[in-house]
Interface confidence: low
């Protein structure tokens, strides 16, 4: 006989990421005896909630909670029964709910209450449903990326924990209703609202973060649609041969399109809008989303928002990844440089509807919107955030790291469950459980 070492007991945590366009559930796991080690927490499983985001249920709050049931039932199966009671469950809502909270706070409260009522029916340790601030969303995304890539501390071959010399990665998140940029900076921020100081594993981090509400992919598409209606009567970013009926009430219902709303528009009017495959007019339309006219600080990104120069390497995830992945994989276009990214956007915007469908068989959902999406990503990175060719070379577009989705959810759970200690770890021996 020989001694067989039993694998350690695992602990679990659940986060519901209630985004503007959909909700995702992430279940994380980690060895119970190594809670304070870095890179120990990983994704156990995930589940996409069918239908729209919880903010789309403003008129039917119980529908929001009902939509989550399928994934919660999956969680009952994925987490061992004996661990249910000790498994923290969080729901964090982002920009979709931030927008709803601006326009209809009562509806926003009703949705959160309905969701809370359902989540408390489950045997997990429910710890609240709340709307994250843009700053939290940015910082937790940054924490997730750097935790997964082991940039905070690492276990060395000499049997001690050390801080890797490579430094941290910046994080860029493009959601449905907002976009976030977060990176470590050495100098204090001129705008204190953009600075967050973190103490992780005994190290001090000064982080710049900003969230641009209404600059998420879906809201950008809505704003471009409103601009196209206002200025052209056709859509330069849509492919020639693509046409659809646009309900004005849908276009102007978002607070993001409020500025473009005509004074006496008929919300029930439907306008037929056609694409024109015009990359230059599309670029102009996208440029109109950014304002560079005034800056109350020594330097700004856009819209008068302070931003230090981008420094170091970055990971760009969520819709940044999906957009670039579409250009790379579906269209077969190179995107290694800013120049290539711009050329790829122009290429997509030049395609007619028939050409686009032929190149991307299976009529991918929202195919007509990829030109605008690509043009926006290119403009946001180059003109908005100020990436030049050299800095862009340090940007990686990634969906996952260490088999775990990159996003704010893991960082949020690590923070709320105190899985990243502020104090430095002592001398601990590493154990491999693979």
């Amino acid at each position: 006989t020989r001694d067989v070492r039993e694998p350690p007991a695992l602990k679990y945590g659940i986060v519901l990421d209630a985004g503007s366009s959909h909700t995702s559930m992430f279940i994380y796991k980690w060895p119970a005896d190594k809670e304070n080690d870095t890179g120990i927490v990983g994704q156990h499983s995930s589940c996409d909630v069918p239908g729209g985001g919880i903010s789309s249920y403003a008129d039917n709050p119980s529908g929001a909670s009902q939509s989550l049931v399928g994934c919660l039932e999956q969680a009952l199966q994925d987490v061992p029964k004996e661990r249910h009671a000790g498994t923290p469950l969080y729901l964090g809502a982002t920009a979709g709910m931030r927008l709803l909270n601006l326009t209809n706070p009562e509806a926003s409260t009703s949705v959160l209450m309905a969701v809370t009522h359902t989540l408390t029916q489950y045997p997990f340790d429910f710890r609240g449903a709340r709307i994250l601030s843009g700053q939290e969303e940015g910082v937790f995304g940054w924490v997730t990326a750097n935790y997964l890539l082991e940039n905070f501390i690492k276990y060395g071959w000499v049997g001690r924990w050390f801080r890797p010399r490579k430094g941290t990665l910046g994080a860029m998140d493009l959601g449905g209703a907002s976009t976030q940029i977060t990176f470590e900076t050495t100098s204090p921020a001129e705008d204190r609202a953009s600075e967050v100081q973190l103490h992780l594993y005994g190290q001090h981090y000064r982080v710049y973060t900003h969230s641009f509400l209404c600059y998420g992919r879906d809201q950008v598409l809505q704003r471009l649609l409103a601009s196209a209606l206002q200025t052209h009567g056709f859509h330069p970013c849509w492919p020639r041969g693509f046409s659809t009926q646009v309900l004005l009430g849908d276009v102007y219902q978002s607070p993001c399109t409020m500025a473009q709303r005509p004074q006496n528009f008929n919300s029930s009017a439907r306008v037929s809008l056609s694409g024109s495959s015009d990359p230059h007019l599309c670029r102009d339309l996208v440029s109109g989303l950014f304002s560079f006219s005034s800056c109350p600080f020594s330097r700004c990104s856009f819209n008068g928002v302070f931003q230090p120069p981008v420094a170091g390497n970055f990971v760009a995830f969520s819709a940044f990844f999906y957009t670039v992945d579409f250009l790379r994989t579906s269209m077969g276009l190179p995107v290694a440089t800013l120049q290539q990214l711009e050329a790829a956007a122009v290429n997509v915007c030049n395609q007619t509807w028939a050409q686009l469908q032929a190149r991307v068989p299976g009529q991918r959902a929202r195919l007509a919107d990829y030109c605008a999406g690509a043009m926006f990503v290119q403009q946001l990175l180059s003109r908005g955030y100020g990436f030049d060719e050299r800095a862009f070379g340090g940007v990686i577009f990634q969906k996952k790291a260490a088999d775990t989705a990159v996003g704010w959810a893991l960082g949020y759970m690590l923070n709320l469950t105190n899985l990243i200690p502020a104090d430095p770890p002592g001398l601990r021996k590493g154990t491999d459980f693979s």
């Epitope: 503007s20 729209g52 789309s56 309900l247």
Partner: antibody
């Protein structure tokens, strides 16, 4: 092609129960909710309830709670609806309908995209 | 629950005629679907989300409206359009249908 085939007509006595079936083909059964709709003679269509076949979760119109029970057999790609304590007002054609949906700017839109041929249930002594 | 009232209850039209069926909701809804039901058949989806034509439906059918008032228009009626047309709301639980408009062809 996508098809929903329902069981045949039933004649039942008041107070009895009946279980009708709806066999799906041409698509992945667990990917779509299945709804049931009542059409009584000369009356409007009424939504009874639905089931999510993937997770066996059913939701009912308050008016049909206790009257209808919706279940599925995933292995047979079949949805069932049992009607209990039948009365003459339960005489109707009952349809199963697949719940299609699409997303448009983050809002979910649902509709019944495929219907079964209907099952006539007659309650008579 | 939201009550959908359709008018007229019955409509008689000649081939080639343009007709409009209406659907009024007791309170505001986000969108409406339209179904067509021929005698002895199950309903079939005609228009979803107020104005989108379902697969295989001829372009003579169109829908519009918002809030509490929606319409279904047939630009040039054909003999095979004889049927009952139902509107249906999926904005507020429980999902409800209108009482139907019966279209007869002269």
């Amino acid at each position: 092609q996508v098809q929903l085939v329902q069981s045949g007509a039933e004649v039942v006595k008041p107070g009895a129960s009946v279980k009708i079936s709806c066999k799906a083909s041409g698509y992945t059964f667990t990917d779509y909710n299945m709804d049931w709709v009542k059409q009584a003679p000369g009356q409007r269509l009424e939504w009874i309830g639905d089931i999510n076949p993937k997770y066996d979760i059913s939701t009912y119109n308050q008016q049909f709670k206790g009257k209808a029970t919706i279940t599925v057999d995933k292995s047979a790609s079949t949805a069932y609806m049992e009607l209990s304590s039948l009365r003459s007002e339960d005489t109707a054609v009952y349809y199963c309908a697949r719940r299609g949906f699409f997303l448009y700017y983050g809002i979910n839109y649902y509709y019944f995209d495929v219907w079964g041929q209907g099952t006539l249930v007659t309650v008579s002594s | 629950e939201i009550v959908l009232t359709q008018s007229p209850a019955t409509l008689s039209a000649s081939p080639g005629e343009r007709i409009t069926l209406s659907c009024s909701a007791s309170s505001s809804v986000s969108y409406i679907h339209w179904y067509q039901q021929k005698p002895g058949q199950a309903p079939r989806l005609l228009i979803y989300s107020t104005s989108n034509l379902a697969s295989g439906i001829p372009a003579r059918f169109s829908g519009s409206g918002s809030g509490t008032f929606y319409t279904l228009t047939i630009s040039s009626v054909e003999p095979e359009d004889a049927a009952v047309y139902y509107c249906h709301q999926w904005s507020s639980y429980p999902w409800t249908f209108g009482g139907g408009t019966k279209l007869e062809i002269k």
